[in-house]
């Protein structure tokens, strides 16, 4: 009852003449276990005798020993674990049909078929590739063999045109009661070379001899694979000759389906086969020429060719790297002019004259001057001809105004307090001339452009200068103005002595004076009104208190003259000229108040006085005035008085006084 | 010109997980395979596995479990996962890059990075 | 997976000898490849396809075989071709590389 039994196996096994074969093999039996097993070649059921009759390559006994049997065949199952896989090695062509599996169980007996194929030679491996192959795209390469055994080592290896392929392959071997199988996956990324080329998968044995090989050709599908072709097969041409391009599809799988061509990357105009005839070619058409051609598997461009229409020189312009361009800067001109080939020649000219020793296309003024601006033009010349020269670029050459000078324009002499015009002028100047600079810096009026006027002009107004600018300011020399002026700083100075004037000094006056223009002076010296001497220098032998007073001294010029503040001369000089005086007169009478009053002469004033008597006996009084209070007729008597300050002391005569007697007195008489 | 570079932790504990960066210059991950490579210190090579142009990859059989391979073509760099690290895992990684996009023999090395595997 | 075996493990020679160092794979390869490491450098391609000098290295270094057996020979040994040389395969995955030979100075 086949409900009973559950036995897997591959079904079919295949191998070859002298090969061996692995057959995997599990079983499960419902009821019971399996006591008997026995392996049939062919096995056919005798109805008559109710049993199954056949070549008996193996046969378990009852005990589970195995028999000596037939040493090829192997039983590697056993009872324990449900196996009953076997193995037969080596294997034989006749070895080819059913092998029946006969398992019997205290209550059940069953016959399971294997089939069993062995060719007489190897038979080849299968080759599975992908539906498509698509360049540059990984696949997987798959080489099948329905064969593994563990008695009987092979290998498949892959080869490309005969030759071994470099990528490494993964083998998988399969000995499971589901399949048998050994099997070699390659990753390949093809690429449109590969295309129609063939792969193989060979089986080698173990000592690397190739048994059987399966051949597939490559149909790997690419874009179209292109080159160019130019003919003439020059791409520099001239203007007017005509071109053909072609495009040539090396390759394409599938087949090409469209065609157009591509001038600078852009698609050109209904050309849409692979030649491309340019007739009487100009020099817009030269260019990066290629062709794209698209199949299924998309498009495809070629190389680009550079097609040259070579051309005489174009009418030429003159770029120049800066203008206007300032003084001392340096100057790039080139010279422009379309053609092929480049120019070999160029002929400069400046303001229509040609420039010497000028032949490349461009050249440098390092330093730039005036002189150099002007209209700049050139011709270009190459193997074609001279091109027509253009119409040329001006340079303009800016610098600061040139040669800046200054004018005084009113008569000379100038004298302080005029009004003085200063005009400031300028040789050239480029840009012209907007503002002017002067210096030193004053609210000085500028009536015009360049013009200054200076009134009231100062004695020390000594150099002025000015600056002429444009852009730049350019400064004149300094011009000296040469303001006359009368004497200046006129003043007294004692020259000596040093210390104060004692009476009897010698004493000398300087007078001084700080500047004068012109240099020439005289000299005058003046006291009270009085002219003294027309020296710089006043002196004094033996100064006396009578030449103190007030001093002057006077510079003149020829422009005019100076006098100095007055100047104090004071002498210094002990008391002198005492006297002593009496308000009330020489005659007194007792009783009365007597005063005496000493008179001096002195430089400084005196600080001290003192009074004697007609016997120089000394009073005690030391002021100026002697005050006698009651006096007394005992008090008659010359008396004299003395006089102190810091230079010395001076005394004056005897003045008598007299003291006469009252009535009052003489009537008590 | 072709330049690798690997990028890893140095120091992991045993269990944990590794992930190493290999940085690429000077071509296009969509057409050549990366592999990588490792050596136990004073040890020979081991194969680790590969991926390729494609995306697809290849692992060496006895570590399969543990390992996965991307990368991400834009950055240009191709990435290292292995799980449950033990210490014989310890060793100097390599990225590696075949001479030609269909050849065998590794022309590029990285410098590579040493993966100490310590508690 | 391809099992490489690199013999001998360490070799000793002077300058000038002629060094051949031996790979065996464990099943057919159809490519071999030879690096060389120094230490603390990163291994670098000497040969590929079997018998290809890669960029650089110099003309003393050569490789051959086929199948199971592969060799690399440096003609006249020199001190800065001292470091350790290890095969790799890239017939099937896993790539698997020899456990290398150490190669030293006298």
């Known amino acids: 009852d086949s409900s009973k039994w559950n036995i897997e196996h591959p079904g079919t096994i295949y191998a070859w003449e002298g090969a061996c074969v692995w057959v995997p093999c599990t079983y499960r039996v419902l009821d019971g276990a399996l006591e008997t097993f026995i392996l049939f070649h062919n096995p056919e059921y005798n109805q008559n005798m109710s049993k199954f009759e056949g070549t008996r390559l193996y046969e378990s006994t009852k005990d589970g020993k195995l028999p000596s049997g037939q040493k090829r065949v192997q039983f590697l199952g056993n009872k324990i674990n449900n196996n009953c896989t076997l193995s037969i090695h080596p294997v034989h062509v006749n070895d080819s049909g059913q092998l029946g599996l006969r398992m019997v169980s205290k209550t059940e007996k069953w016959m399971e078929r294997i089939h069993l194929n062995v060719s007489e030679r190897p038979f080849p491996p299968r080759i599975q590739l992908p539906p498509k192959l698509q360049e540059s795209q990984e696949v997987t390469l798959t080489c099948l063999l329905n064969f593994s055994c563990y008695g009987y080592q092979i290998q498949l290896q892959w080869l490309l045109e005969g030759v071994p392929m470099r990528q490494a392959a993964v083998t998988l071997t399969s000995l499971s009661t589901k399949s048998v199988f050994t099997r070699s996956e390659l990753k390949f990324s093809p690429q449109w070379s590969h295309h129609g080329k063939i792969v193989t998968c060979e089986l080698h044995d173990v000592d690397g001899k190739v048994l059987s090989e399966d051949m597939v050709q490559l149909n790997v599908k690419h874009t179209p694979k292109l080159t160019i072709e130019v003919t003439p097969n020059e791409t520099t041409v001239r203007k007017g000759d005509s071109v053909t391009m072609t495009c040539k599809v090396n390759s394409s799988n599938p087949e090409y389906t469209t065609v157009s061509w591509l001038k600078d990357g852009i698609p050109l105009k209904e050309q849409n086969t692979l030649m491309l005839t340019l007739h009487k070619v100009t020099k817009s058409q030269s260019g990066r020429y290629c062709c794209r051609v698209s199949n299924d598997v998309g498009p495809a461009t070629s190389e680009k060719v550079f097609l040259q229409v070579q051309y005489a020189p174009e009418s030429s312009r003159v770029q120049i790297s800066q203008s206007p361009a300032v003084e001392g800067s340096e100057v790039n001109f080139l010279c422009i002019s379309p053609a092929n080939p480049l120019p070999t020649n160029y002929t400069w000219y400046h303001n229509g004259k040609e420039v010497q020793g000028r032949t490349e296309k461009q050249f440098q003024i390092q330093k730039i001057l005036p002189w150099h601006a002007g209209t700049y033009s050139c011709e270009a010349e190459n193997i074609l001809g001279i091109g027509e020269r253009g119409p040329g670029t001006e340079l303009d050459v800016q610098y600061p105004p040139k040669k800046v000078t200054m004018v005084i324009e009113n008569p000379t002499p100038i004298r302080e307090g005029d009004t003085v015009t200063l005009s400031c002028n300028y040789s050239s100047s480029n840009p012209i001339v907007n503002h002017y600079e002067w210096r030193p810096r004053g609210a000085w009026e500028e009536p015009s452009l360049g013009v200054l006027k200076i009134q009231n002009i100062g004695w020390n107004n000594t150099a002025v200068a000015c600056a002429a600018c444009n852009n730049w300011c350019s400064w004149a020399s300094p011009v000296t103005l040469n303001v006359l002026y009368a004497p200046r700083g006129v003043r007294v100075r004692k020259i000596k002595p040093l210390s104060e004037i004692h009476s009897g000094n010698s004493v000398s006056l300087q007078c001084d004076f700080s500047s004068s223009h012109p240099k020439e002076v005289q000299f005058f010296w003046e006291k009270n009104g009085s002219l003294l001497g027309k020296e710089s220098q006043l002196n004094f032998d033996s100064i006396s208190p009578e030449d103190a007073g007030s001093y002057s001294c006077w510079v003149n010029n020829s422009i005019g003259q100076t006098a100095s503040k007055a100047w104090t001369l004071e002498v210094l000089y002990a008391p002198r000229r005492l006297r002593v005086s009496m308000s009330q007169g020489n005659q007194v009478m007792e009783g009365k108040t007597a005063t005496l009053i000493c008179e001096s002469d002195a430089n400084p004033p005196v600080y001290s006085y003192a009074w004697f008597d007609w016997n120089n006996q000394s009073l005690p009084y030391s002021g100026r005035m002697l005050r006698l209070e009651p006096v007394k007729v005992q008090h008659s008597g010359a008396y004299w008085c003395q006089g102190t300050n810091r230079v010395g002391k001076g005394h004056s005569p005897l003045i008598t006084l007299t003291v006469y007697y009252s009535p009052q007195t003489i009537g008590r008489r | 010109q072709v330049q690798l570079k690997e990028s890893g932790p140095g120091l992991v504990a045993p269990s944990q997980s590794l992930s190493i960066t290999c940085t690429v210059s000077?071509?296009?991950?969509?057409?050549?395979?990366v592999h990588w490579v490792r050596q136990p210190p004073g040890k020979g090579l081991e194969w680790l596995g590969m991926?390729?142009?494609?995306?697809?990859?290849d692992y060496n059989s006895a570590l399969k479990s543990r390992l996965s391979i991307s990368k991400d073509n834009s950055k240009s760099q191709v990435f290292l996962k292995m799980n449950s690290l033990q210490t014989d895992d310890t060793a100097m990684y390599y990225c590696?890059?075949?001479?030609?996009?269909?050849?065998?023999?590794?022309?590029?090395w990285g410098q590579g990075t040493l993966v100490t595997v310590s508690a | 997976q391809i099992v490489l075996t690199q013999s001998p493990a360490i070799l000793s020679t002077s300058p000038g000898e002629k060094v051949t160092m031996t790979c065996s794979a464990s099943?057919?390869?159809?490519?071999m490849y030879w690096y060389q490491q120094k230490p603390g450098s990163s291994p670098r391609l000497l040969i590929y396809?079997?018998?290809n000098l890669a960029s650089g290295v110099p003309v003393r270094f050569s490789g051959s075989g086929s199948g199971t057996s592969y060799s690399l020979t440096i003609s006249r040994m020199e001190a800065e071709d001292a470091a350790t040389y290890y095969c790799?395969?890239?017939?099937?995955?896993?790539?698997?590389f020899g456990a290398g030979t150490k190669l030293e100075l006298k």
């Open positions: 000077g071509f296009s991950l969509s057409r050549y395979t």
């Open positions: 099943s057919r390869v159809n490519y």
């Open positions: 590696a890059r075949p001479h030609d996009f269909d050849a065998g023999g590794f022309a590029y």
């Open positions: 991926i390729w142009g494609g995306g697809s990859t």
């Open positions: 790799q395969q890239w017939t099937s995955y896993p790539l698997t």
């Open positions: 396809d079997t018998s």
